[in-house]
């Protein structure tokens, strides 16, 4: 099966690399802007250079290209605790990121919230803390993980998954309470 | 066919409190995110909070961090905003979301429940 082809890729699969057909006329292949450039006029003939000009402050094109203008760079989101890593240059987008001993949960694709790495307090760190993922903890004896933090098993109900863990807390408790019923 | 009905919306002091609900059906809930969203009159829509399926990650907008409380009961296919230290200010129609997070980065609604109306006033 051949994939299917938008127009754009069909016109330029007729030139070789670096060129792109010249939308008024198909016998011509214009060469295609750099990085940091877009492309302002189509070649006039064969062989002939094609009009790019650079793009204005706040906008980039990343990749070679024939586009018309070039694309506003992203901000970053601060309501969503991001922070710029690098700024925007005329070939490179701006590249957000999460301050230090933070990471990424992605509510989608291109939609990032920086929370802060989980300690693991009454526990241990089984996995660090990475980019994209909070670190994971192993909580110690008397305690139960909930939402990521060790908590103790007194807090333990017995409609709770939590039981499983706490199990043997909640027999002494149910125990003592046993006991001070004779 | 999907259905979102939020309740709990009425007229409240400043300083008040109020909890509204979203009761969910039609879909399976635990699998969404989920979120509340706000008009108030005669202005756009304002992202409120939002919540991940298993409920590990919040999203709150700064005008109602530290006041507002997002959470879901997924054995009850329900989502809840506890609102505290009400004001003025948050008077609106209160909408519950599925899938806040494509409409908040893209307009992009997917469903979206009637609203309920919450009036702050003395």
């Known amino acids: 099966l051949v994939p299917h082809l938008g127009d754009r890729e069909k016109r330029d699969s007729v030139c070789p690399q670096g060129k792109y057909i010249h939308p008024q006329n198909n016998s011509i292949c214009c060469t295609k802007c750099h990085k940091g450039t877009y492309l302002y006029n189509d070649c006039p003939g064969p062989g002939q250079d094609t009009d790019c000009r650079e793009c204005e402050s706040g906008s980039f094109t990343a990749s070679e290209n024939h586009l018309r203008h070039c694309l506003s760079c992203s901000k970053c989101r601060k309501e969503m605790g991001q922070v710029e890593i690098s700024s925007c240059t005329v070939d490179r987008d701006t590249v957000c990121g999460c301050r230090k001993n933070q990471y990424r949960h992605y509510w989608s694709e291109n939609l990032f919230q920086c929370f802060n790495c989980s300690l693991c307090l009454n526990g241990t760190v089984h996995l660090s803390c990475q980019e994209k993922q909070n670190t994971v903890c192993t909580c110690h004896a008397g305690f139960f993980l909930r939402e990521n933090e060790c908590v103790s098993c007194s807090n333990c109900k017995k409609s709770l998954e939590c039981t499983k863990l706490c199990l043997p807390q909640i027999e002494n408790v149910k125990g003592t309470e046993d006991s001070g019923t004779t | 066919e999907v259905q979102l009905l939020e309740s709990g919306g009425g007229l409240v002091q400043p300083g008040g409190s109020l909890r509204l609900s979203c009761a969910a059906s039609?879909?399976?809930?635990?699998?969404?995110?989920m979120g509340w969203a706000r008009q108030a009159p005669g202005k756009g829509l304002e992202w409120v909070s939002f919540?991940?399926?298993?409920?590990?990650?919040?999203y709150y907008a700064d005008s109602v961090k530290g006041r507002f409380t997002i959470s879901r009961d997924n054995s009850k296919n329900t989502l809840y905003l506890q609102m505290n230290s009400l004001r003025a200010e948050d008077t609106a129609v209160y909408y519950c979301a599925q899938n806040p997070q494509y409409a908040y980065e893209s307009s992009r609604f997917d469903y979206w429940g009637q609203g309920t109306l919450v009036t702050v006033s003395s």
């Open positions: 039609g879909f399976t809930f635990s699998d969404y995110t």
């Open positions: 919540i991940d399926s298993d409920g590990l990650h919040t």
